[in-house]
Interface confidence: medium
């Protein structure tokens, strides 16, 4: 299963970085789980998951760094709280869960770049 | 004549970049002229250029944006005053003025990716 | 849907070599990624290699130079040439498989694969 997602994205100087994550959909899924990679020299790690119904929304756990929001066969997904040290390869995984046949499909990835901001000077 | 430089570099939240701009020469030259080239959507603009003897300072104009200093084939080149609107491919481009025969050579070029820092709150 | 099936697992001295197969059915996908996997008791689950469907590999350090994984696309079915093992590669060894060639080029992670065989456990004693 084809998953299409953008090849760079820089997170804004709050540390707010947001990507589509596009699934071509061999069956009708009506379950849909959906999970965040990150690659950072050859280290894989997972960054968020969440699995919906198809029409309804993502839900994150309370604790997640990722919110989204799912439209057809798109993902809108939102990873907040990023620093310098979080820059590396985000990988759209997408999994059809239900009705059977299983499908899987891998992104290419997303490089997020983030920089982080000077302080601002003290106000007092 | 081969130019290296990185294919990505960040902007700091200062709106400074700096790269290296490597070339093989293949002489023993005295003069050398690099000029940054940037482009964006096909338009290609000269940002700033030096002349330097070999073993002596890079100096640009006054009201450049760019610095830099140059140790044996290699050029350390800085932009200041970048903004979001700045991003693009900065390419290098390294002329072996003299003595003749004249080389040139260009590179191919470094993703500069500038974020616009958030404003500080008033402190008023 | 996707199925996996291991063999080839076994006891050997160490020095000794064995040659795992997988054999996979209901495989749709014009690019894809197969790769063995091993987990030793109490460890977590970690590549060994991995190969795509154009024949790009790739290895886990430790086992470059002794292991190679190939593949029948006229069988469907994957292999594992091992040789000279060491008591260090005693493990259950699983068969993978994902869709595109993602994994095969970049990282030997789970995380990557979705579709899984059982296992066989290869016992390599000293």
């Known amino acids: 299963m084809h998953v299409a997602q953008p090849a760079v994205v820089l997170a804004s100087s709050r540390g707010i970085a947001s990507f589509v994550c596009e699934y071509a959909s061999p069956g009708k899924a009506t379950e849909v789980r959906v999970t965040v990679l990150r690659q950072a020299d050859s280290q894989v790690t997972e960054v968020c998951a969440a699995t919906y119904m198809m029409g309804n929304e993502l839900t994150f756990l309370d604790d997640s760094i990722c919110t989204g929001t799912s439209s057809g066969n798109q993902v809108n997904l939102t990873i907040q709280g990023l620093r310098a040290m979080d820059t590396g390869l985000y990988i759209c995984k997408v999994e059809l869960m239900y009705p059977p046949p299983y499908y899987l499909g891998i992104g290419n990835g997303t490089q997020i770049y983030v920089i982080d901001p000077e302080p601002c000077p003290d106000s007092d | 004549m081969h130019v290296a430089q990185p294919a990505v570099v960040l902007a700091s939240s200062r709106g400074i970049a700096s790269f290296v701009c490597e070339y093989a020469s293949p002489g023993k030259a005295t003069e050398v002229r690099v000029t940054v080239l940037r482009q964006a959507d096909s338009q290609v603009t000269e940002v700033c250029a030096a002349t330097y003897m070999m073993g002596n300072e890079l100096t640009f104009l006054d009201d450049s944006i760019c610095t830099g200093t140059s140790s044996g084939n290699q050029v350390n080149l800085t932009i200041q005053g970048l903004r979001a609107m700045d991003t693009g491919l900065y390419i290098c481009k390294v002329e072996l003025m003299y003595p003749p025969p004249y080389y040139l050579g260009i590179g191919n070029g470094t993703q500069i990716y500038v974020i616009d820092p958030e404003p500080c709150p008033d402190s008023d | 849907q996707v199925q996996l099936q291991e063999s080839g697992g076994g006891s050997v001295q160490a020095g000794g070599s064995l040659r795992l197969s997988c054999a996979a059915s209901g495989y749709t996908y014009s690019s894809y990624s197969m790769g063995w996997f091993r987990q030793a008791a109490g460890k977590e689950r970690e590549g060994v290699a991995a190969?795509?469907?154009?024949?790009?590999?790739s290895y886990a350090d430790s086992v470059k130079g002794r292991f190679t994984i190939s593949q029948d696309n006229a069988k469907n079915t994957l292999y594992l040439q091992m040789n000279s093992l060491e008591p260090e590669d005693t493990a259950m060894y699983y068969c993978?498989?994902?869709?595109?060639?993602?994994?095969?080029?970049?990282?030997?992670?789970?995380?990557?694969?979705?579709?899984w065989g059982q296992g066989t456990q290869v016992t390599v004693s000293s």
């Open positions: 993978a498989a994902t869709a595109g060639w993602y994994a095969a080029r970049h990282a030997l992670s789970p995380l990557f694969f979705g579709y």
């Open positions: 190969i795509d469907s154009d024949g790009s590999t």
